[in-house]
Interface confidence: low
């Protein structure tokens, strides 16, 4: 009797679905794995016999709602199915922005850009996909707990009226208006105000 | 590296309670996904609770469902479970986990969380 794999899961990152699995426990180490997934109602070969232990599953429609399954097999004997379930636009996790700073007086000017996404052309992020993306900036003076957020549709945002002189961190993760739905955060960036007094020549 | 740090733990009699607390760094404190994970000895781990850190879910396993209770402050970077009711078969080393986003219709299973505090121990006495 085969043990089925062990640990199944569906990592899937800014698009880029990756089903993992673990070996099970078994004496003999030659052990493959066929994942399949399930595509009018019949399931399709995507990885077969692989000695792998994860499976590329990026290629799926983005707005499908799936059962993925994998499979340990030793020459004719094979274990039972391990299944997951599995809707690429809701489960996908959502990957940090990026972001550029820069100082002008007592303000720091941010510029955003959206996570790409895996096997779309190279200009396609995820505003493509989800209408309702915005950006929540939060930002805190370096050193203290405070910390402030913002909310903006746009891929820029200006953080006026800051102290001067002043080192600010910052960070910003994508979210979903319409779902209360939140990416995962940027590491923090820290930037220095300057002054917006003219000081003599 | 992202750390978390459980505290609260300790020894109470049956019936009584503890508050735990698990602080992270600045990096976890809003991401999606925390959870509180115990383990007996000679048991497996049991994911207790869970909550989604926008405050729009939580989990209980049925074991705990109306005893405990899992809040977090965000502005602390703190999660904590309030146990009460506590009976001797809540004796466990309890682990603060977390990851970036939960299941959508599910608790996660104690593998999807990559992140783990240390463990506070619990000890519930008849």
């Known amino acids: 009797m085969i043990p089925p794999p062990e640990k199944v899961r569906m990592n899937s990152v800014n698009f880029k679905n990756i089903l993992q699995w673990e070996v099970p426990a078994f004496p003999k180490t030659n052990l493959t794995f066929t994942a399949q997934y399930e595509s009018y109602r019949s399931f399709q070969d995507h990885c077969k016999r692989t000695a792998s232990t994860q499976c590329d599953f990026s290629h799926l429609s983005k707005y499908g709602d799936y059962t993925v399954r994998v499979r340990a097999e030793l020459a004719d004997e094979h274990s039972e199915w391990v299944n997951v379930t599995f809707c690429p636009v809701e489960d996908t996790i959502i990957g940090p922005p990026e972001m550029q700073i820069e100082s002008l007086a007592e303000s720091l000017h941010l510029r955003f850009s959206a996570p790409q996404i895996e096997n779309e052309p190279e200009t396609w992020t995820l505003k493509n996909i989800y209408d309702s993306w915005a950006y929540r900036v939060q930002y805190w003076k370096n050193g203290t707990n405070e910390k402030f957020q913002v909310v903006s549709p746009y891929d820029s945002e200006v953080l006026r009226n800051l102290e001067p002189w002043t080192t600010y961190c910052i960070q910003v993760q994508g979210f979903l208006l319409d779902q209360n739905r939140t990416g995962e955060w940027s590491e923090p960036i820290c930037e220095r105000t300057g002054n917006d007094e003219i000081t003599p020549s | 590296q992202v750390q978390l740090q459980e505290s609260g733990g300790g020894s109470v009699q049956a019936g009584g309670s503890l508050r735990l607390s698990c602080t992270a760094s600045?990096?976890?404190?809003?991401?999606?996904?925390m959870a509180w994970i115990r383990q007996a000895p000679g048991s497996e781990r049991e994911v207790v609770a869970t909550?989604?850190?926008?405050?729009?879910?939580?989990y209980y396993a049925d074991s705990v469902k109306g005893r405990f209770t899992i809040s977090q402050d965000n502005a602390k970077n703190t999660m904590y479970l309030q146990m009460n009711g506590l009976k001797p078969e809540d004796t466990a080393m309890y682990y603060c986990?977390?990851?970036?986003?939960?299941?959508?219709?599910?608790?996660?299973?104690?593998?999807?969380?990559?992140?783990w505090g240390q463990g506070t121990q619990v000890t519930v006495s008849s």
């Open positions: 986990a977390a990851d970036r986003r939960c299941p959508v219709s599910r608790a996660p299973y104690e593998y999807e969380l990559r992140y």
């Open positions: 909550i989604v850190t926008d405050g729009s879910r939580t």
């Open positions: 600045r990096y976890i404190a809003l991401n999606a996904c």
